[in-house]
């Protein structure tokens, strides 16, 4: 079975500073997989930010990086200059 | 047991396209990345670029302009295009299986064709 | 110039220990990339010889090994013999590029 395991539960981020989070792949290849990146905010909304390769929601594309570490079979989701707005909970799913 | 095999013409005039087929004998093509390779007489290894089963690919950035590699699963294959080459671009070129190896936390090469010598002249 | 360093060549005699460097740096092997090293005996394709820095495939004879201190790995041969006389490749991934895969120069080991 596959499983997607983020790297940590709760990441600190300082205003302006770029943020990296990881979602590792657990049981499979991850590059046979298209990887996806949510937010889910305060009003339980679950917002699309990203899927493989180079496809953003409205309005993420420009502070968002999505990308795979395919030698360490994670999912990467950088946050370029993360403000108050980008506060949340971030999942990452994975498709074929 | 595995087989990779190269095919392709041995022999491609400047300014033309390199085009090499690699099949894949012994396990379905899904489950794994597949690479190609190439050597010039002499010299080291050279990555050229890798593409997985869902279609998306990475290319070595000194090659990413001439570059197309696409996968056919029905037919256990994969293939290369180079385009634009010239006499620096003859080399053998290998394909190679690339697994990810969920024990170990390791991807590596494990499997590769016997190579194909591909000569650009006019 | 390849972005993993490794001597041109390296020798010794039949049943001695030789070892291949190679050097990489905070992208490759220091960003906790793991290395494979690689056999390629003259005319051949090459054959996986370690992964993860220290593990050797089904069939791969002890007598071969790999450490990892730093951003730099080693690949030992102990009982040299002389079927062992090959080019030996190191080669890892750089974080630079997605899945940008990199190798050394290659050393060729001489029996004598």
């Known amino acids: 079975a596959i499983e997607l395991v983020p790297e940590h539960q709760t990441v600190p981020v300082s205003i302006g500073v770029p943020a990296t989070l990881r979602c590792s792949m657990k049981g499979e290849a991850i590059g046979n997989y298209y990887i996806n990146w949510y937010r889910k905010t305060q009003g339980n909304t679950m917002t699309f930010i990203y899927r493989e390769k180079d496809i953003y929601g409205p309005g993420f594309k420009d502070n968002f990086q999505g990308d795979i570490d395919i030698a360490k079979n994670l999912a990467v989701l950088k946050i370029l200059a993360p403000s108050e707005r980008d506060e949340g909970s971030y999942y990452c799913a994975c498709d074929t | 047991q595995v087989q990779l095999q190269e095919s392709g013409p041995g022999l491609v005039k400047p300014s033309e396209t390199l085009s090499l087929t690699c099949t894949v004998s012994?396990?379905?093509?899904?489950?794994y990345y597949w690479n190609y390779i190439r050597q010039p007489a002499g010299k080291g290894l050279d990555w050229i670029?890798?593409?997985?089963?869902?279609?998306?690919?990475n290319y070595n950035p000194s090659l990413k302009s001439r570059v197309t590699m696409s996968v056919d699963t029905s037919k256990n294959q994969f293939s290369l295009k180079l385009t634009s080459v010239t006499a620096a671009d003859t080399a053998v070129y290998y394909c190679?299986?690339?697994?990810?190896?969920?024990?170990?936390?390791?991807?590596?090469?494990?499997?590769w064709g016997q190579g194909t010598l591909v000569t650009v002249s006019s | 110039q390849s972005v993993l360093t490794q001597p041109p060549s390296v020798s010794g005699a039949p049943g001695q220990r030789v070892t291949i460097s190679c050097t990489g740096s905070?992208?490759?092997?220091?960003?906790?990339?793991?290395i494979k090293w690689y056999q390629q005996l003259p005319g051949t394709a090459p054959k996986l010889l370690i992964y993860?820095?220290?593990n050797r495939p089904s069939g791969v004879p002890d007598r071969f090994s790999g450490s990892k201190s730093g951003t730099s790995v080693s690949l030992a041969i102990t009982g040299l013999q002389a079927e062992d006389e090959a080019d030996y490749y190191c080669?890892?991934?750089?974080?630079?590029?997605?899945?940008?895969?990199?190798f050394g120069g290659g050393t060729k080991l001489t029996v004598l």
């Open positions: 080669q890892s991934y750089d974080s630079s590029m997605s899945g940008y895969v990199v």
């Open positions: 670029g890798r593409i997985f089963t869902t279609g998306n690919t």
């Open positions: 993860g820095n220290s």
């Open positions: 012994g396990d379905s093509i899904s489950g």
């Open positions: 905070s992208s490759n092997i220091g960003a906790d990339y793991d």
């Open positions: 190679a299986r690339e697994r990810w190896d969920s024990s170990s936390s390791a991807l590596y090469f494990d499997y």
